[in-house]
Amino acid sequence: KSPIFGPEEVNSVEGNSVSITCYYPPTSVNRHTRKYWCRQGARGGCITLISSEGYVSSKYAGRANLTNFPENGTFVVNIAQLSQDDSGRYKCGLGINSRGLSFDVSLEVSQGPGLLNDTKVYTVDLGRTVTINCPFKTENAQKRKSLYKQIGLYPVLVIDSSGYVNPNYTGRIRLDIQGTGQLLFSVVINQLRLSDAGQYLCQAGDDSNSNKKNADLQVLKPEPELVYEDLRGSVTFHCALGPEVANVAKFLCRQSSGENCDVVVNTLGKRAPAFEGRILLNPQDKDGSFSVVITGLRKEDAGRYLCGAHSDGQLQEGSPIQAWQLFVNEESTIPRSPTVVKGVAGGSVAVLCPYNRKESKSIKYWCLWEGAQNGRCPLLVDSEGWVKAQYEGRLSLLEEPGNGTFTVILNQLTSRDAGFYWCLTNGDTLWRTTVEIKIIEGEPNLKVPGNVTAVLGETLKVPCHFPCKFSSYEKYWCKWNNTGCQALPSQDEGPSKAFVNCDENSRLVSLTLNLVTRADEGWYWCGVKQGHFYGETAAVYVAVEERKAAGSRDVSLAKADAAPDEKVLDSGFREIENKAIQDPRLFAEEKAVADTRDQADGSRASVDSGSSEEQGGSSR
């Protein structure tokens, strides 16, 4: 499939101009290669009309130009003084005409409307409101006012001042008489439909002295805005329908066959299953505008999207709408990453998150997608040393391994941790990736005591048992804090006896704290890694108390079977105030994020339930 993309259909009227934008992947080769616009012949072939190398056909002399915008990966063809002869099938493309790096465009130029003299033209968008003004003279002030629509040769009554309303206009039309002083009556039609377009006649009086005024109503179907995004990337649809629909339910739908438009998401709580975990509808502003973010773009997401407003939360005749044509470029710069990570209760996961490696200094974030209230993604951790309170001691974001990948480690897993998470940065907003954490049956691989109490001034030894399957891994102990996990010296105490059917390659590695102080209190992790790549971890909370009896402490696994330290999250932890990025610019626009970590809830972001790419978590 060609990665070139443009408008499938362009419609205009004789004498007008058109501007056609074509998109291409902005590789260095593509940026510098020839761009062209050609007309397809009946027997195949495509005759160049204009190219970026300066060629302009005589048919286009003085009325067309082609401009390349290499930084955007677009070029624009402008054609003026259109005639019906310009109607036809064209291609915009790169390289040589016959190579196939092109996109087919159909241009339709229609004749301008033949209007009667003194006709007022009203041009209004589909779903909007039109007010047709009808002047009259004093002698007709007390007489019947009416509006007719010309259907073929016959005028059909639409509305009149005696209370008649044509059934096609019921509930969306009114006739206003301004008071005799103004000598004007108005007909207001709401929720305009394409079928409302045509010639109208307004009339005051019924005899030969009646006042008449012709009106031509043109109802415009919105031209879709072209959107070109990378596979696995994200897209934001900004929908501004105007303050008159501020209190009406909003929706985003995707056109399927024919006129059907399947709801993707709406403000009434509906969401298509294919977008679970990877879509957010940002809250609407007072003016009724809102935006929808979709991440983890798939090939099948390509197509025409409409946003609109209707009390049903779906497209109906007369809904005001905005349209986009989304093209998903399969020649993506965004790397693949596992979309599913598995862990066991009590175990851990280490998630590798990709980011744009040109933006190594950007702030990295990890958030939990929540489906309620149209979707939201409250932050859990960032690379600046902030961790959401309920995750202290069990969540860490590491800049390693770096150069396009960062790591998020979450341990002490429970079934409540299952769900969709987003990796994102405050840099390139197209690089938002989604991972689903699944909690599966099994036991954690690493064995540590459940809770440990150290005595001030004494020595504490905490064991961590590693099964033999980790023999090729580096084993470590570290002390958790908001900015990561600082490595500590540890002792390899030889084979562990904690595992059945495990040979000499199992290991017992102990953490020793000498002369314990209050500062030693906190969370400690033992884990495995290979270089800068982190695997499984286990967490222990060390409490420090006053000396009761002399001697050092050596904690065994037997003591670990006591109830775990009560840092365990309570069942309602998701309802506790969420730390979140509230600034929707992080998700909605290509702008830096304001530091909003101390704001209340309301973040907006998005996720890829993606293919079944899987990365293991804790245990198999």
Epitope: N403, H532, F533, E536
Partner: nanobody, 117 residues
């Protein structure tokens, strides 16, 4: 089904070079970090090197740092290990593995590297 097939091993003199390859199939290769591990005769598994899915980040065990280079070609679904300045203690069976952080043991046959004069 995940399949990893190593090749490129052989007998080489100390100071010599070899390039190992690992052909991957059955999973989306570019999504995963990949690792090389080795096992000498009568020894446990030893980690050698690891590379991120996009190839941007690599790590090496101290014993091979400066001598070995890991790389990948995602278009060909292939992982490489360039081994220079080989020493007798590098003699081992070398395995490639998909990184999962779980201690999953290599399921492949491996390729034998023998460094001897």
């Amino acid at each position: 089904e995940v399949q990893l097939v190593e090749s490129g091993g052989g007998l080489v003199q100390p100071g010599g070079s070899l390039r190992l390859s690992c052909a991957a199939s059955g999973f989306t290769f570019s999504s995963y970090a990949m690792t090389w591990v080795r096992q000498g005769l009568g020894k446990g598994l030893e980690w050698v090197s690891i590379i991120s899915g996009n190839g941007g980040s690599t790590s090496y065990a101290d014993s091979v740092k400066g001598r070995f280079t890991i790389s990948r070609d995602n278009a060909k679904n292939t992982l490489y290990l360039q081994m220079n300045s080989l020493k007798p203690e590098d003699t081992a069976v070398y395995y490639c593995a998909k990184w999962d952080g779980l201690g999953t043991l290599p399921g492949s046959q491996g390729t034998q590297v023998t460094v001897s004069s």
